[in-house]
């Protein structure tokens, strides 16, 4: 029975091999089945100590939940066992395998992946709620500047059609709980808050339920207060780049500013062999600055096309507002094209990185 994306019905006590790292396996089990998830070490090498996690929480072994380094067994599965499972390296917390498990009301009827009959796949069989796009449910932290609009979504399905409700910090959340109210769009499974303020910070949980079970997802909202400070530039951006002659390069600069920022991209140049003027100010040329039709988002990216050796050097993202300026710099190294490198090698030259 084809159930769409990487999703299959698995018979009782059937063992599911782990997906390749980075790939999310979506699985459907029947009520009462034994869920067996297998996560072999990537590349067949040693795995080291691992932990199994469900919906972000470490699984505690019990008589019903049997945890091994490469295998997880959940006996006599019920709706409450639906959720997002992952196997992680204990030390690094690196995710080795992802599984989205849905336990339906009816016991499953064996592994019938090859069947072409799609009549079964109408989504109308009775069952507990499940996320319709589970791979989209992994953005759990949202940080936005004050006065922005925030939207949380939890698209789900089930039969009967589940209801959705929202909690803030574990308590029922209603429009009267905030100035400006909230917009609940049940059909779109969304909660919208316009013009957020610091008091909107907290954990927002969607609870999706029907008579067969419930699922929930918690998002953490951080509201960045508007305070009089110069622009903040994201650490590590722009990043140093190495490019081959003739290729395209992009530098990125993330600017956070309450007061309207003015963003410029500068390239450091030499004048009469000197990089700085008599007063110690670097010589620069402005490559990109705000125009009538440029947005802040567009100014956060500097694109260089078909780079030449002359493009090598230091680039600076300069952001200013009414309070002050901030800047971050990065270097571009331009390497010869591969054919030139080969010719140079044959001539006995060595290129140091």
């Amino acid at each position: 029975e084809s159930l769409g994306t990487e999703q299959r019905v698995v018979g009782r006590a059937a063992e599911v091999p782990g997906p390749e790292p980075g790939q999310q396996e979506q699985l459907v089990f029947g009520s009462g089945d034994a869920v067996e998830l297998s996560c072999p070490p990537p590349g067949g090498g040693p795995m080291g100590p691992t932990v199994w996690v469900k919906d972000g929480t470490g699984l505690v072994p019990s008589e019903r939940v049997l945890v091994g380094p490469q295998r997880l067994q959940v006996l006599n599965a019920s709706h409450e066992d639906s959720g997002a499972y992952s196997c992680r390296q204990r030390l690094t917390q690196r995710v080795l395998c992802h599984f989205s498990v849905r336990v339906t009301d009816a016991p499953s009827s064996g592994d019938d992946e090859d069947g072409e009959d799609e009549a079964e796949d109408t989504g109308v069989d009775t069952g507990a709620p499940y996320w319709t796009r589970p791979e989209r449910m992994d953005k759990k932290l949202l940080a936005v500047p004050a006065a922005n609009t925030v939207r949380f979504r939890c698209p789900a399905a089930g039969n009967p059609t589940p209801s959705i409700s929202w909690l803030k910090n574990g308590r029922e959340f209603r429009g009267e709980h905030r100035i400006g109210g909230i917009k609940l769009r049940h059909q779109q499974w969304s909660l919208v808050m316009e013009s957020v303020v610091p008091s909107d910070r907290g954990n927002y949980t969607c609870v999706v339920e029907n008579k067969f079970g419930s699922i929930r997802q918690t998002y953490t909202l951080d509201v960045l207060e508007r305070s009089p400070h110069r622009p903040i530039l994201q650490a590590g951006l722009p990043a140093n780049q190495t490019a081959v002659l003739g290729s395209d390069v992009e530098f990125h600069c993330k600017v956070y500013s309450d007061a309207q920022p003015h963003i410029q991209w500068l390239k450091h140049v030499e004048v009469n062999g000197s990089k700085v003027g008599p007063d110690g100010t670097p010589y620069v040329t402005v490559l990109k600055t705000a125009g009538a039709n440029t947005t802040d988002k567009e100014l956060e990216v500097l694109s260089l096309h078909n780079v030449t050796f002359e493009d090598a050097g230091e680039y600076t993202c300069l952001a200013g507002n009414s309070i002050g300026f901030s800047h971050h710099s990065a270097w571009l190294v331009v390497l010869p094209a591969e054919e030139e490198l080969v010719e140079a090698d044959e001539a006995g030259s060595v290129y140091a990185g």
Epitope: G4, T5, P21, G22, Q23, Q24, Q26, V95, H98, T122, G123, V124, T132, R133, P134, E135, R136, D138, K139, R153, P155, A157, T161, Q187, Q188, W189, H252, K254, K297, E298, E300, V301, S303
Partner: antibody
């Protein structure tokens, strides 16, 4: 300006593999998912799968599970789709398209025409 | 998989007319429907998502409506540049699926 620049047309022999690239520019690549879509000549659109550039997590349409492999190189803001064991049925235009969370494909690449022929 | 059915393969219209393109899902997609326009030799372009939200820069003559399994894209006053292929897509549940398309042409 947001742009998704795809690699050029390709003519390959049956049984071979091909890797199509999609270079994103004008936005931060990790803010959006990257989807891939197939359009056979004169036909509708088929969703192949998507990749989260933040962590490389992929989701595939079952139909393309054994055909396509999606990867991303964050450092070059480039997404890739490798198609293997090619047959004439795989001849089509392939698009990359970005999506923010659950909100439809707001920008598309120009398409890469793949022809499989001996 | 959810099947999206566009019952009209072709629709004839005149400039200035009001036209409605329909799309039916094989099951409730909870307003998770997008509409795309595709002109010959070009990539599809997003018009509407979540059934009724107009994408940035899309003229307000395009409106989307519907719920459950039935969805409509309406073009209030058709312009010559609107003659194209229109696809519906459900973006509610994976695998995402598209309709077969409706070609809008001149009478």
């Amino acid at each position: 300006e947001v742009q998704l620049q795809q690699s050029g047309p390709d003519l390959v022999k049956p049984g071979a593999s091909v890797k199509i690239s999609c270079k994103a520019s004008g936005y931060t690549v990790t803010d959006y998912y990257m989807n891939w879509v197939k359009q056979s000549h004169g036909k509708s659109l088929e969703w192949i799968g998507d990749i989260n550039p933040n962590n490389g997590v992929t989701t595939y349409n079952q139909k393309f599970k054994d055909k396509a492999t999606l990867t991303v190189d964050k450092s070059s803001s480039t997404a890739y789709m490798e198609l293997r064991s090619l047959t004439s049925e795989d001849s089509a235009v392939y698009y990359c398209a970005r999506e923010e969370d659950f909100d439809g494909f707001d920008y598309w690449g120009q398409g890469t025409t793949l022809t499989v022929s001996s | 998989d959810i099947v999206m059915t566009q019952s009209h393969k072709f629709m004839s219209t005149s400039v200035g007319d009001r036209v409605s393109i329909t799309c039916k899902a094989s099951q409730d997609v909870s307003t998770g429907v997008a509409w795309y326009q595709q002109k010959p030799g070009q990539s599809p372009q997003l018009l509407i998502y979540w059934a009724s939200t107009r994408h940035t820069g899309v003229p307000d003559r395009f409106t989307g409506s519907g719920s459950g399994t039935d969805y409509i894209l309406t073009i209030r006053s058709v312009q010559a540049e609107d003659l194209a292929l229109y696809y519906c897509q459900q973006h509610y549940s994976t695998p995402l699926t598209f309709g077969a398309g409706t070609k809008l042409e001149l009478k």
